[in-house]
Interface confidence: low
């Protein structure tokens, strides 16, 4: 079966295109090409005589074109009009005719796109911001390209438009980009120069740095404060709610107890107007911020009732600390018996009874932290009596 | 949904005829070259003939070239395999497909594969 | 026999990553592209990789294709269980005006 073919199909724009046919019949005296999908004299583009080799052009001839002895036909410096379809007629020999019709598509050579904005300083999650693709051409592709790689699935990006206008709803500060549009058709493609977004956000809740909370008189204060915005923002501190500076960073040296308080850095974003604060408390103190554990110990921790003292010894390496005594969870002294002494470092019953078996521990504290010693266990017999609370030293 | 659904199978003599349809839906069918695939019984697939988007052109594998014949009807969104001189080697089911892309994009270097198949008919040759 | 030529059987783990190769000549795959179809059991085929390497809609970017000279491959990474199904290369010849499919592989997920 007569058939046939373009080569290419898809043609670019002022190139050419050869329409090959297959299958041609033997015995002929010739062939025509017309115009369209089906013969008309009018659209006649060239008939070609086998016998003569005599190619003779017809009404719809351009000049660009030219028939080959196999019947192919070459159309040269082809235009977007010449996209459709194309007829041959072969004349048989017994004077049966058969058709083939083929087409082609012509397309234009692409140009380096460009994106339009409609907000190129959006605000994060408040604004939206669609970009365009230009030109717009017919039978083009657009393609979206962010960071380099192909849109990915969210219900925040929007295509419309045939694709050409790309809207991201409540942009957020990772949308910056960059971003580039693709216009393809079947012969060319090319790609935009990149476009970013400058994403106004901020500020967020500021961090003060360093964390510490407790200086020593003397030593200097340095603290920073920091708070994701952009454009970046505008910074003040305030000691106890009275304002001190404009800046990032406060510097405070030689500090005294006086210098104790609240500080609160102010982070400011003049163009999405929003403000965010952070208080950190600052104890400046001769206390150690951490007060270690003390050491108990028992003159003995089995006694006999009515009979024998005890001392309770409380040891710590500190300095400037309290003490108190617990019995049972029960703050002491909590009887005549009970004697505290020597800064409340020693605890000392006398005499000891029944009711003071049991678990014994003190605390060290300071205005500012405290710790507790391990427990200990005071035992207390009577002669000629079973044991009783028999427990060893906790 | 794009949908492609093949009628016309069943049991034939050796030497008989059939003729195989394919109704399509969910596209413009009238843009898209289609084919007919078949595999017999536990074996792999077998290409047996295209058909342009327009009818253009036609092409058969060499093994049911002058027995099958392509067409379409793209009025009727149909597409049609009629087979003559059928031998038991031509025991199969056959699939019909669709091109994945319409005919404005036929160069070769996209162009020739299937991406949407119907279920599939089967034939059956035998005395 | 087919004028693609595939590996009969294949085999893998789950998450294991597995390759089949089509090898054709230069009529075929030397100078048109490559197209690799899927084919669950008792089920109609499925596009899987078309011009080499692009994937349609749907199918997981678990499967690459690519093409170099007269030879094409297929790769599965993440090997999983749904993937056990006879796997088919197919270009268009240029030489015999048609379409060529390769014997088919059959993928075995143990």
């Known amino acids: 079966q007569l058939t046939t073919e373009s080569m290419p199909f898809n043609v670019a724009e002022g190139k050419e295109v050869l329409l090959l046919v297959h299958n041609l019949p033997q015995q002929l005296f010739g062939y025509s090409w017309y115009k369209g999908e089906r013969v008309d004299g009018n659209r006649q583009i060239v008939g070609y005589a086998i016998g003569t080799q005599q190619a003779t052009p017809g009404p719809a001839n351009s000049g660009r074109e030219t028939i080959y002895p196999n019947a192919s036909l070459l159309i040269q410096n082809v235009t977007q009009n010449d996209t459709g379809f194309y007829t041959l007629q072969v004349i048989k020999s017994d004077l049966v005719n058969e058709e083939a019709t083929g087409q082609f598509h012509v397309y234009p050579e692409l140009p380096k796109p460009s994106i339009s904005s409609n907000n190129s300083n959006p605000v994060e999650d408040k604004d939206a911001v669609a970009f365009t693709c230009e030109p717009e051409t017919q039978d083009t592709t657009y393609l979206w390209w962010i960071n380099n790689q192909s849109l990915p699935v969210s219900p925040r990006l929007q295509l419309s438009n045939g694709n050409r206008t790309l809207t991201l709803l409540s942009v957020t500060r990772n949308d910056t980009g960059p971003y580039e549009c693709e216009i393809q058709n079947p012969v060319s493609a090319n790609r935009s120069d990149p476009v970013t977004l400058n994403v106004t956000y901020g500020p967020d809740t500021p961090t003060i740095s360093p964390s510490d909370t407790y200086y020593r008189p003397g030593a200097n204060l340095s603290l920073s404060c920091y708070a994701a915005s952009n454009p970046p923002a505008q910074y003040s501190w305030l000691i106890n709610g009275t304002f001190q500076q404009s800046t990032q960073e406060l510097f405070i040296p030689n500090i005294t107890v006086n210098n104790s308080g609240s500080y609160t850095c102010h982070a400011n974003n003049s163009v999405t107007g929003c403000n965010r604060t952070t208080v950190k408390t600052i104890i400046v103190t001769e206390l150690s911020p951490v007060v270690a554990k003390p050491q108990i110990k028992a003159s003995k921790t089995t006694v006999t009732g009515d009979k024998d003292s005890v001392n309770l010894t409380c040891s710590t390496n500190d300095t400037g600390i309290s003490i108190r005594w617990f019995f049972k969870n029960q703050s002491l002294p909590s009887s005549e018996r009970m004697k505290l002494s020597q800064g409340n470092t020693t605890l000392s019953i006398n005499p000891v009874k029944r009711e003071d078996a049991g678990t014994y521990w003190c605390e060290v504290f300071n205005p500012i932290s405290k710790n507790q010693s391990d427990p200990i266990m005071l035992n207390v017999n009577y002669n000629a009596l079973p044991q009783e609370n028999g427990l060893s030293p906790g | 949904e794009v949908q492609l659904l093949e009628s016309g199978g069943g049991l034939v003599q050796p030497g008989g005829s059939l003729r195989l349809s394919c109704a399509a839906s969910g596209f413009t069918f009238s843009d898209y070259d289609m084919s007919w695939v078949r595999q017999a019984p536990g074996k792999g697939l077998e290409w047996v003939s295209m058909i342009y988007s327009g009818s253009s052109s036609k092409y058969y594998a060499d093994s049911v070239k002058g027995r099958f014949t392509i067409s379409r009807d793209n009025s009727k969104n149909t597409l049609y395999l009629q087979m003559n001189s059928l031998r038991a080697e031509d025991t199969a089911v056959y699939y019909c497909?669709?091109?994945?892309?319409?005919?404005?994009?036929?160069?070769?270097?996209?162009?020739?594969?299937?991406?949407?198949w119907g279920q599939g008919t089967l034939v059956t040759v035998s005395s | 026999q087919s004028v693609l030529t595939q590996p009969p059987s294949a085999s893998g783990t789950p998450g294991q990553r597995v390759t089949i190769s089509c090898s054709g000549s230069?009529?075929?795959?030397?100078?048109?592209?490559v197209t690799w179809y899927q084919q669950l059991p008792g089920t109609a085929p499925k596009l899987l990789i078309y011009a080499n390497s692009h994937r349609p809609s749907g199918v997981p970017d678990r499967f690459s294709g690519s093409k170099s000279g007269t030879s094409a491959s297929l790769a599965i990474s993440g090997l999983r269980s749904e993937d056990e199904a006879d796997y088919y290369c197919g270009s268009w010849d240029s030489s015999l005006n048609a379409y060529v499919f390769g014997g088919g592989t059959k993928l075995t997920v143990l």
């Open positions: 230069s009529s075929n795959i030397g100078s048109n592209n």
């Open positions: 497909a669709k091109a994945p892309l319409p005919f404005y994009f036929r160069p070769k270097s996209y162009y020739y594969a299937m991406d949407v």
